[in-house]
Interface confidence: medium
């Protein structure tokens, strides 16, 4: 059978390096060598390429070399295959080299803002030192910000032979880490050269974006004042523009700004202590360019009224996220704040708020909150300077087992009853809403019975038990992930009432 | 898997500093507390101390303040602990464990490193 | 802090026995009491929490008892795979400490 005719010749000029032809079929059923025959010199001159017959038999490749490799030129190729019955010949197939000439990457040698131009990057690179020092290249530039998986590319083309380049990458964000990769072909080339090394540079700074500005309200001391911590962060959805040196704060009783108090700082939160009226409070960020713009907030006095306008709540969850919404009487408040901590005790809280406009729902992503952590959610209505009575839920984004069972004792054993008393679990080894307990009991050598009971229940009297007998106990508190046995106790129910016998006594 | 890979072994002159990793598979470390065990040979089980990689928040066993540092890089699911002035006395092995609440149980402990402390 | 103090330090044993470990701590820690297994060359697992809850997966010839200061660890019917070191474990309080372990070896 003669060998199949080679089809889909395809051809690529790494320059200075090599010419290589690649067909198919890349294998034979009986063993096949070839030949690929090639005109070069626009056809004045040609030569062969044999594919070696013991180590590259059935090898659907071949590589000219130099010094037979010009350019520019035009070259035909055609590839015999031969096998033991015959030789079949391809179509004749015509290359310009200009047009399959694949080149090195270039090298970024630096990425740099230029000095008083915002939003803007200079990358500098060396053209590849193997390339046709007369043609022109074009480049494709690929960007990222340094914590984004998603690349942008920009294209463009550079004719001048000089070896360092530059390209002026504007409309990025300020004061943005950006990692930049580069590649290059000429520009009749089909061809692109690899991706040069990563290079990373960073944007211009500019003057500070807006502040969220929020208060945790503390309950009055003995001697009157009343702390006010006061917390502020980058406004929701400003862009990282610049590295904040410090804030203002400024604040004084409402009609009274010769009481005007400034504070200093470089944290994101400060404690304030006040008096009994209403307070203004302002706070600006501000760096080596500039100040943001002023956040307010108004203390309310001490004895004003808040207004109460959220009737409703819930907390469920989806496939990755918590997501809280709540219903409101008042159709003009479209402005929220929504706090959330663990509700832990024996560990400092680390409490966290985000303000929520034009909705009545709030989502975070479960990854965001642990697991078996009870998490305090409360949502303040806030009606343009006034800050309104809070809702408050709590939520689970993952229940477990509780890590202790209740601790169990028997009181008031009689004849045929017995009550049962068991402590809440502490909150830091509930791992979940508490759903109901179950009271396990069994008399010596017989059957275990259950009793499962609410989770407001911490107390149960067992009755129509055998008079006499030895019993073991043991309750399960369960969450929905499942249930923990507690502590077992043992008793025995009493012979005689205690009650019985007093009265025989008196007799 | 649910695991906590740790580096084998580490030798270390006395009077110098060691820090150990530990890092998750299978689950995030922010979600958990990381608690570092130190193990002699032939001899019990010391508790070092641990860290909340959400917040950094840590807490120490008083033997070991001041001496460990217990750090956390949640971008790449990784616990540290810093020993610093080893003696001889600290030649054991290192274990990470996860510690799911303030008080539960180490359901996955690491695979322990091996710290040697000689001239 | 609290001291956890555990007995025996060796058991030999063959196999088919009943094994008892006890712990005792210096203050009472309520139930919060955990058994681990360290077998040659591993890291501990997790065997008993809450001092009488086994943890998924445990085979129920392992069970724990107790409560406030004396706790015990039981393996029913001890086979030869349970050749390891056991150490109790109190997270009552800060620090944590651990009992010093028993060695359980099979004749």
């Known amino acids: 059978v003669l060998p199949a005719k080679p089809e889909n010749i395809s051809c690529i000029f790494y320059y200075e390096e090599n010419f290589t032809c690649t067909w198919s079929p890349e294998k034979e059923a009986s063993y096949t060598w070839y030949k690929v025959k090639r005109t070069y010199s626009y056809g004045y001159k040609s030569d062969i390429c044999s594919t070696d017959n013991s180590t590259r038999g059935n090898h659907a490749s071949c590589s000219f070399l130099p010094p037979t490799i010009t350019n520019p030129d035009n070259y035909t190729i055609q590839v015999e295959a031969q096998n033991a019955d015959g030789i079949m010949k391809s179509d004749i197939t015509y290359w310009n080299l200009d047009a399959i000439m694949k080149i090195e990457p270039p090298e970024i040698f630096s990425v740099k803002s230029v000095l008083g131009i915002k939003r803007m990057l200079q990358i500098k690179w060396i053209r590849p030192v193997l390339a046709p020092h007369s043609s022109t290249l074009k480049y494709t530039l690929r960007f990222r910000t340094i914590n984004s998986a998603y690349w942008m590319e920009v294209n463009f083309t550079k004719e001048d032979i000089d070896r360092d380049e530059t390209y002026n990458l504007t409309e990025l964000q300020a004061f943005t880490e950006y990692v930049m990769t580069l590649r290059c072909a000429p520009a009749e080339s089909m061809f692109w050269s690899g991706w040069s090394q990563e290079k990373v540079g960073t944007t211009e700074e500019e003057a500070p974006y807006g502040l969220d500005l929020w208060r945790v309200l503390k309950p009055a001391m003995v001697d009157g004042r009343r702390p006010v911590q006061l917390m502020w962060k980058k406004a929701t959805g400003a862009p990282v523009l610049e590295k904040a040196l410090g804030y203002n704060i400024w604040y004084f009783p409402e009609n009274n700004t010769n009481l005007t108090e400034t504070v200093n700082t470089t944290n994101q939160t400060h404690e304030l202590y006040l008096g009994g009226k209403t307070y203004w409070v302002y706070v600006v960020s501000y760096n080596s360019l500039g100040e943001s713009p002023v956040a307010t907030l108004r203390i309310p006095a001490l004895n004003e009224k808040t207004f109460q306008c959220i009737e409703a709540m819930q907390a469920c969850l989806t496939q990755d996220q918590l997501v809280v919404e709540w219903q409101s009487s008042a159709p003009e408040v479209d402005t929220w704040m929504v706090e959330w901590f663990p509700d832990v005790d024996s560990e400092p809280s680390s409490f966290s708020w985000e303000s929520v406009s034009q909705a009545r729902n709030w989502t975070i992503q479960k990854d965001e909150l642990k697991p078996l952590w009870c998490y305090n959610i409360s949502v303040y209505p806030v009606l343009r300077d006034r800050v309104g009575q809070p809702y408050s839920t709590q939520a689970y984004v993952q229940e477990g087992i509780p890590s202790a069972g209740p601790v169990t004792q028997a009181d008031s054993i009689g004849v045929k009853t017995v009550t049962i008393t068991w402590k809440e679990i502490p909150k830091s080894k509930r791992n979940g809403f508490i759903k109901n307990y179950t009271i396990f009991y069994q008399a010596e050598d017989g059957k275990e019975f259950s009793k499962t009971v609410n989770s407001n229940i911490l107390q149960y009297r067992l009755e129509s038990l055998t008079r006499r007998t030895s019993y073991s106990l043991q309750v399960m508190a369960s969450t929905n992930a499942g249930g923990t046995n507690g502590t077992k106790i043992n008793f025995k129910t009493l012979s005689i009432s205690h009650h019985h016998h007093h009265h025989h006594h008196h007799h | 898997e649910v695991q906590l890979q740790q580096s084998v072994a580490e030798l270390v002159r006395p009077g110098a500093s060691v820090k150990l990793s530990c890092t998750a598979s299978g689950f995030n470390i922010k979600n958990t507390f990381i608690h570092w065990v130190k193990q002699r040979p032939e001899q019990g089980l010391e508790w070092i101390g641990r860290?909340?990689?959400?917040?950094?928040?840590?807490k120490y066993a008083p033997k070991f303040q001041g001496r460990a540092t217990l750090t956390a890089d949640t971008s790449s699911n990784t616990a540290y602990l810093q020993l610093s002035s080893l003696t001889s006395e600290d030649t054991a092995i290192y274990y990470c464990?996860?510690?799911?609440?303030?008080?539960?149980?180490?359901?996955?402990w690491g695979t322990g490193t091996t710290v040697t402390v000689s001239s | 802090s609290i001291v956890m103090t555990q007995t025996p330090k060796f058991l030999l044993v063959s196999a088919g026995d009943r094994v008892t470990i006890t712990c005792k701590a210096s203050q009472s820690v309520t139930n919060d009491v955990t058994w681990y297994q360290q077998k040659p060359g591993q890291s501990p697992k997790l065997l008993i929490f809450s001092a009488s809850n086994r943890y998924t997966g445990v085979p129920d010839r392992f069970t724990g008892s107790g409560y406030g200061t004396d706790f015990t660890f039981t393996i029913s019917t001890v086979q030869a795979e349970d050749l390891a070191v056991y150490f109790c474990q109190q997270d009552y309080s800060s620090p944590w400490t651990f009992g010093g372990g028993t060695k359980l070896e099979i004749k």
């Open positions: 464990a996860r510690y799911y609440y303030v008080s539960s149980y180490f359901d996955v």
């Open positions: 860290i909340d990689p959400a917040n950094g928040n840590t």
